[in-house]
C-alpha cells in the first residue's frame, strides 16, 4: 500500500506512518514505528498537557505568586493549568492574570456601578441629579438625597453630586 499523506483525527504523520497522538495529561516518549505503537508517559507532578499532542515535555503549572497578590483559584491537574486569581481587594491586570492591582475607588461625586471581582476592576458612574457620594470608596453606590418633605422639613441647602441636601424646620412665621 502507498504510504499515507494524511492521518485520522488524533493521529500524526511521521516517517510515512500514521502514529497515535498522546492523550491530554501525557507526553510523547517515542514515536510509533513499523513495529510499535506510540509510547506516551503521564506528566509529572505540577505539569500538564491539555490537548492530544506529540510534545516531548509537559508544561509547568502556572505559579500563583503571592508577592504579586495572586492566589490559586483552581488547582491544576495533569490535563489543565492552574488558574490564578487575586487576593481580596485586588484584581488581575490581564486575562492571563499574571499580576494584580488594587481595586480602584470611586471618588466623591461618583458611585460604584459594579463592584470589582478577582478579574475585573471597579466600575464607577457619576452620581446623577438627586444622588450623591461624599466618600472615596470601592463599594459605596451613589446615595439618594434625603427627602426633606417626608420628614416634614424643608430644604435649607441644595444637594450636589458630592453632598446631601440639608433639611431644616418649616418657617413657622405667618403673615
Amino acid at each position: 500500500p502507498e504510504p499515507p499523506t494524511a492521518c485520522r483525527e488524533k493521529q500524526y504523520l511521521i516517517n510515512s506512518q500514521c502514529c497515535s497522538l498522546c492523550q491530554p495529561g501525557q507526553k510523547l516518549v517515542s514515536d510509533c514505528t513499523e513495529f510499535t505503537e506510540t509510547e506516551c508517559l503521564p506528566c509529572g507532578e505540577s505539569e500538564f498537557l491539555d490537548t492530544w499532542n506529540r510534545e516531548t515535555h509537559c508544561h509547568q503549572h502556572k505559579y500563583c505568586d503571592p508577592n504579586l497578590g495572586l492566589r490559586v483559584q483552581q488547582k491544576g491537574t495533569s490535563e489543565t493549568d492552574t488558574i490564578c486569581t487575586c487576593e481580596e481587594g485586588w484584581h488581575c491586570t490581564s486575562e492571563a492574570c499574571e499580576s494584580c492591582v488594587l481595586h480602584r475607588s470611586c471618588s466623591p461625586g461618583f458611585g460604584v456601578k459594579q463592584i470589582a471581582t478577582g478579574v475585573s476592576d471597579t466600575i464607577c458612574e457619576p452620581c446623577p441629579v438627586g444622588f450623591f457620594s461624599n466618600v472615596s470608596s470601592a463599594f459605596e453606590k451613589c446615595h439618594p438625597w434625603t427627602s426633606c418633605e417626608t420628614k416634614d422639613l424643608v430644604v435649607q441647602q441644595a444637594g450636589t453630586n458630592k453632598t446631601d441636601v440639608v433639611c431644616g424646620p418649616q418657617d413657622r412665621l405667618r403673615a
Epitope: P1, V29, S30, T33, E34, F35, T36, E37
Partner: antibody, heavy 115, light 112 residues
Framework: QVQLQQPGAELVKPGASVKLSCKAS????????IYWVKQRPGQCLEWIGG????????NFNEKFKSKATLTVDKSSSTAYMQLSSLTSEDSAVYYC????????WGQGTTLTVSS | DVVMTQTPLSLPVSLGDQASISCRSS???????????LHWYLQKPGQSPNHLIY???NRFSGVPDRFSGSGSGTDFTLKISRVEAEDLGVYFC?????????FGCGTKLEIK
Amino acid sequence: QVQLQQPGAELVKPGASVKLSCKASGYTFISYYIYWVKQRPGQCLEWIGGINPRNGGTNFNEKFKSKATLTVDKSSSTAYMQLSSLTSEDSAVYYCTRHGNGVYWGQGTTLTVSS
Amino acid sequence: DVVMTQTPLSLPVSLGDQASISCRSSQSLLHSNGNTYLHWYLQKPGQSPNHLIYQVSNRFSGVPDRFSGSGSGTDFTLKISRVEAEDLGVYFCSQTTHVPWTFGCGTKLEIK
C-alpha cells in the same frame, strides 16, 4: 545512511561480565529505541529488551532482566548492553537493532564464554 | 509469552516455483490500536537478519513485489511467487504486539 556498528567478537571467562557496544550513526540518536536480540546456533532468536536514548527508559524480556543492563551514552551515540555472571549459555551472537523509517541491524557481536 | 510456530522447518523448492511459509501465534496479534504487529525477515548465512515485511503485508522499501504477506489474528503466511537464487536462506516471523517480543524458529528455504 543509518549504521549500527558492533565489534565482531568478545572472548570472556565464565563468571565475568562483558559490556557490548553498538555505535549509531546517520540519524538522530535520541529519536529511536535501540533493541538487543540474542541468536544461538540452532535456536530461536530471543528478544532481550530495548532502551530509549532520549530518557534512558527501558523495556525488557523478564527472562533477561537480571542478566542484562542497558545504557546509552548520548555524547557518542552509543548503546551498551552489559551481561553479568556469564556462563556458556550466554555464548551467542548479539545484535543491536533500530526500527522506525526502516529497520536496521548491527553486524552482531559473537560472544564466547570459555575458560 | 506468545509462541510463534513456523511450518515447514525446511522448504526445498526449484527456482521459479512459488513458496509458502506458515506462521501461527499462540494468541491473537491484533493490537488494541487496530494494527497487527506480525513481521517477516530473511537471514542469509553469516549475515544479520533483513526485514522483508511489517504488519502482516507491508513490504519494506526495496523488497521485490514477489514477496507478499497475508493473514490475521493468529494465522499468517509469507508467499514468494517465483523463487530466485538470492531468496535462499532462513525466513523468520516475529511479533511485537505483546511483550516480550518473540520469534519463530525459522524456515530454511533451499534448492530441491
